[in-house]
Interface confidence: low
C-alpha cells in the first residue's frame, strides 16, 4: 500500500539477481515490540527504544593537521547493554574500551532520558509526516550533491556495529541544502524491521515503510561532530524510505551482497566505492524538511532532517536480506532497529512542493493549515 505523495516515481533498479538467500526471521520476544513510556499513545508495530548506530555512531572529523590533505573519520564510541543469551534482544554494543556513555537498549531500562537528558527534549526525531499539514516552502530548492559518485578505490568500510550496518564515507562528499547551508557526508546506515514487519523510522500519516536509509552530514561550519552536536543545523541527515518493487536494485546490491560477511556483530569488511547518490531517490527537488534530533542517545537536537518524497525500490529478496542477515550482540537478531515517532510539539514540517495538494479525484479540497513563514519558528 502506498500513501499519497510518497510513491516511487522512478524506481532505482536493474542489475542481476543475487544468489544468496539470507537467514530467515527469528521469533523475537514480545518485549521488542512493545511501546515505551515516551511513545505516543495508540502507536502500534513499534519495537522498543532504538539501538542502532545510526546518527549517534557518528564518525569524528579530525583537523587536517592530523592527516595531511584529508579528513580523518573515526567512530565515536557507542555503548553496550547486557543481554540474556537465552532471550534474543537487540542491544547496543561497545566498539571500544573506555566508553563513558551509559548503557541503553531497546525497550528496557534505563529510560533514554536517564542515559541522555536530551532524549526527553521537545524536538525529537523521528516524526510522523502528514503531507496535508506540511508547509509548502518554495524557497526549498533542489538538493545539491557533489562528489557522491565514488570510484571503486579506495574501498569503504562496511560495518555491523551491533545495531545497524554502517558505511563510512570518505572525505569529499559535499551536500548543500541551499545557499550557505553546506555539509559533508560522513556515513550512511539503514533502519529496518523484520519479516512482514516494516522498520522505517519516519512514518507518513502513520504508515511505516519497510526500511529507511540515513546519510549523515556535518556542517562545514564545524570541524568535528562533537562540536556540532546540539547546534542548530550542525548536523543534517538525508532520509529516504525503502519499499518493495519488482526489480533488484543494483546500487543496493553492492552493499546487501556483502552483508553475510559481516553477519557477526562487530565485524566489518571493505567494499568498493560506489555511487552513493544511487542509493537515494532520483528526485532531489521534492522533500520534507524539519528540525529534529539524533534518533538514538545522545538524541542531540538541532539536526536538519530532509526526507525525500520519492521512495527507493528494492526487491523483496533484497529487503529480506537486509532484515534477516545481521546479528546483534549475544543471541539477538539485528532487527526492528527503529525508534518510535516523537511528537512534533508545535514544529511545522516544511515541504519543497505543494504536498497538501492531492491529485487524487477522490480527495477533498485540502486545507493548507501551515505556511512556509510559520515553519521557521
Amino acid at each position: 500500500q502506498r500513501l499519497p505523495r510518497m510513491q516511487e516515481d522512478s524506481p532505482l533498479g536493474g542489475g542481476s539477481s543475487g544468489e544468496d538467500d539470507p537467514l530467515g526471521e527469528e521469533d523475537l520476544p514480545s518485549e521488542e515490540d512493545s511501546p515505551r513510556e515516551e511513545d505516543p499513545p495508540g502507536e502500534e508495530d513499534l519495537p522498543g527504544e532504538e539501538d542502532l548506530p545510526g546518527e549517534e555512531d557518528l564518525p569524528e572529523v579530525k583537523p587536517k593537521s592530523e592527516e595531511e590533505g584529508s579528513l580523518k573519520l573515526e567512530d565515536l564510541p557507542t555503548v553496550e547493554a547486557p543481554g540474556d543469551p537465552q532471550e534474543p534482544q537487540n542491544n547496543a554494543h561497545r566498539d571500544k574500551e573506555g566508553d563513558d556513555q551509559s548503557h541503553w537498549r531497546y525497550g528496557g531500562d534505563p529510560p533514554w532520558p536517564r542515559v541522555s537528558p536530551a532524549c526527553a527534549g521537545r524536538f525529537q526525531s523521528p516524526v510522523d509526516i502528514r503531507p496535508q499539514l506540511a508547509a509548502f516552502c518554495p524557497a526549498l530548492r533542489p538538493l545539491e550533491l557533489l562528489g557522491f559518485q565514488l570510484p571503486p578505490l579506495p574501498e569503504l568500510r562496511l560495518r555491523n556495529n551491533g545495531h545497524s550496518v554502517q558505511l563510512t564515507l570518505p572525505p569529499g562528499l559535499e551536500m548543500a541544502l541551499g545557499p550557505g547551508r553546506e555539509y559533508r557526508a560522513l556515513q550512511l546506515h539503514l533502519h529496518w524491521g523484520a519479516a512482514g514487519r516494516p522498520g522505517s523510522e519516519h512514518t507518513v500519516e502513520g504508515h511505516r515503510f519497510p526500511a529507511e536509509i540515513h546519510v549523515v552530514h556535518l556542517s562545514t561550519a564545524f570541524a568535528r561532530v562533537d562540536e556540532a552536536l546540539g547546534r542548530p543545523g550542525g548536523l543534517a541527515v538525508l532520509a529516504a524510505f525503502l519499499e518493495e518493487g519488482p526489480e533488484e536494485n543494483s546500487a543496493y546490491e553492492q552493499l546487501l551482497s556483502r552483508l553475510e560477511e559481516i553477519a557477526e556483530e562487530g565485524s566489518e569488511t571493505q567494499v568498493p566505492g560506489l555511487d552513493i547518490s544511487a542509493l537515494l531517490p532520483s528526485d532531489f527537488s521534492r522533500y520534507f524538511q524539519y528540525e529534529g534530533s539524533l534518533t538514538t542517545p545522545p538524541c542531540a537536537q538541532g539536526v536538519i532532517w530532509t526526507v525525500f518524497n520519492q521512495t527507493v525500490m528494492l526487491s523483496a529478496k533484497q529487503l529480506h536480506t537486509l532484515s534477516d542477515t545481521l546479528w546483534g550482540p549475544g543471541d539477538s537478531r539485528l532487527q526492528l532497529n527503529f525508534r518510535a515517532t516523537q511528537p512534533l510539539n508545535g514544529r511545522v514540517i516544511e515541504a519543497s512542493f505543494p504536498a497538501g495538494v492531492d491529485s487524487s479525484p477522490r480527495a477533498a479540497e485540502p486545507v493548507q493549515l501551515n505556511s512556509c513563514l510559520a515553519a521557521g519558528d
Epitope: 539470507p22 560477511e261 557477526e264 543471541d331
Partner: antibody, heavy 119, light 107 residues
C-alpha cells in the same frame, strides 16, 4: 583451497583429558567462525561447540558444557578443543568445520579425528 | 532446543528417479536450514543453505525448499554417486541441531 586438518585424537581412559587441534589453511582464518561437530560410531552428527571469528562469542552443547573448552589462535590459524572429564559417551569422530559466516551453515569440514574413551 | 526430525530413515530409489527427503523442525527456524551429504568414511559436505540456496559446486539436481518447520531436499535424478546419508541442520537458534539423517540407496 580450503583445508581443515584435525589432530590430537586417540584412546583415553574415562575421566581423562585430550586436546584436539584443527589447522586451517587456504582462507583467512580470522574472518570465519568455527565449530566442532562430533559423530559417535554409527550415529548422526552432533554439534559440540562454536567460536566466533574473534573468539568473543562461544557456545557449547549442554552435553559438554563445563567439561570442554573451545579456543582459537588466529595468529596460528588454529582451532582447539580441550576435553576434560571424558566419558564413554564422548567416543566419536570429531570434526572441525567452518561457518560460511557468523552462525551460518558449515561449508567446509575436516576429515575428523577419532576419540575413543575406554578403560 | 529445536529438535529436527528427518523422514524416512531409509529411502531406496531406482536410478534416474526422484528422491524426496523431509525434515521437520519442532519450532520455526524460518529459512535457517542446511542440508549435508555424508558418504561412508567421509566428512559431511554442504549441499544447501538458507533452505534453498545451493552451495558452491553443488549440481542443480539437488534442490531445497520449505521454510518455518517443514523442509524438503529433492534429488531430481538419483545416481549411484548420490548414495549417502543426508542430514538437515538448523542454525536459527542455539544450540545448532541436526536431524537424525536419511540413508539414501539405490533400489
Amino acid at each position: 583451497q580450503v583445508q581443515l586438518v584435525e589432530s590430537g585424537g586417540g584412546l583415553v581412559q574415562p575421566g581423562g583429558s585430550l586436546r584436539l587441534s584443527c589447522a586451517a589453511s587456504g582462507f583467512t582464518f580470522s574472518s570465519y567462525s568455527m565449530s566442532w561437530v562430533r559423530q559417535a560410531p554409527g550415529k548422526g552428527l552432533e554439534w559440540v561447540s562454536y567460536i566466533s571469528s574473534s573468539g568473543s562469542t562461544i557456545y557449547y552443547a549442554d552435553s559438554v558444557k563445563g567439561r570442554f573448552t573451545i579456543s582459537r589462535d588466529n595468529a596460528k590459524n588454529s582451532l582447539y578443543l580441550q576435553m576434560n572429564s571424558l566419558g564413554a559417551e564422548d567416543t566419536a569422530v570429531y570434526y572441525c568445520a567452518r561457518h560460511r559466516s557468523y552462525r551460518f551453515a558449515l561449508d567446509y569440514w575436516g576429515q575428523g579425528t577419532t576419540v575413543t574413551v575406554s578403560s | 532446543e529445536i529438535v529436527m526430525t528427518q523422514s524416512p530413515a531409509t529411502l531406496s530409489v531406482s536410478p534416474g528417479e526422484r528422491a524426496t527427503l523431509s525434515c521437520r523442525a519442532s519450532q520455526s527456524v524460518s529459512r535457517g536450514l542446511a542440508w549435508y551429504q555424508q558418504k561412508p568414511g567421509q566428512a559431511p559436505r554442504l549441499l544447501i543453505y538458507s533452505a534453498s540456496t545451493r552451495a558452491t559446486d553443488i549440481p542443480a539436481k539437488f534442490s531445497g525448499s520449505g521454510s518455518g518447520t517443514e523442509f524438503t531436499l529433492t534429488i531430481s535424478s538419483l545416481q549411484s554417486e548420490d548414495v549417502a546419508v543426508y542430514y538437515c541442520q538448523q542454525y536459527n537458534k542455539w544450540p545448532l541441531t541436526f536431524g537424525g539423517g536419511t540413508k539414501v540407496d539405490i533400489k
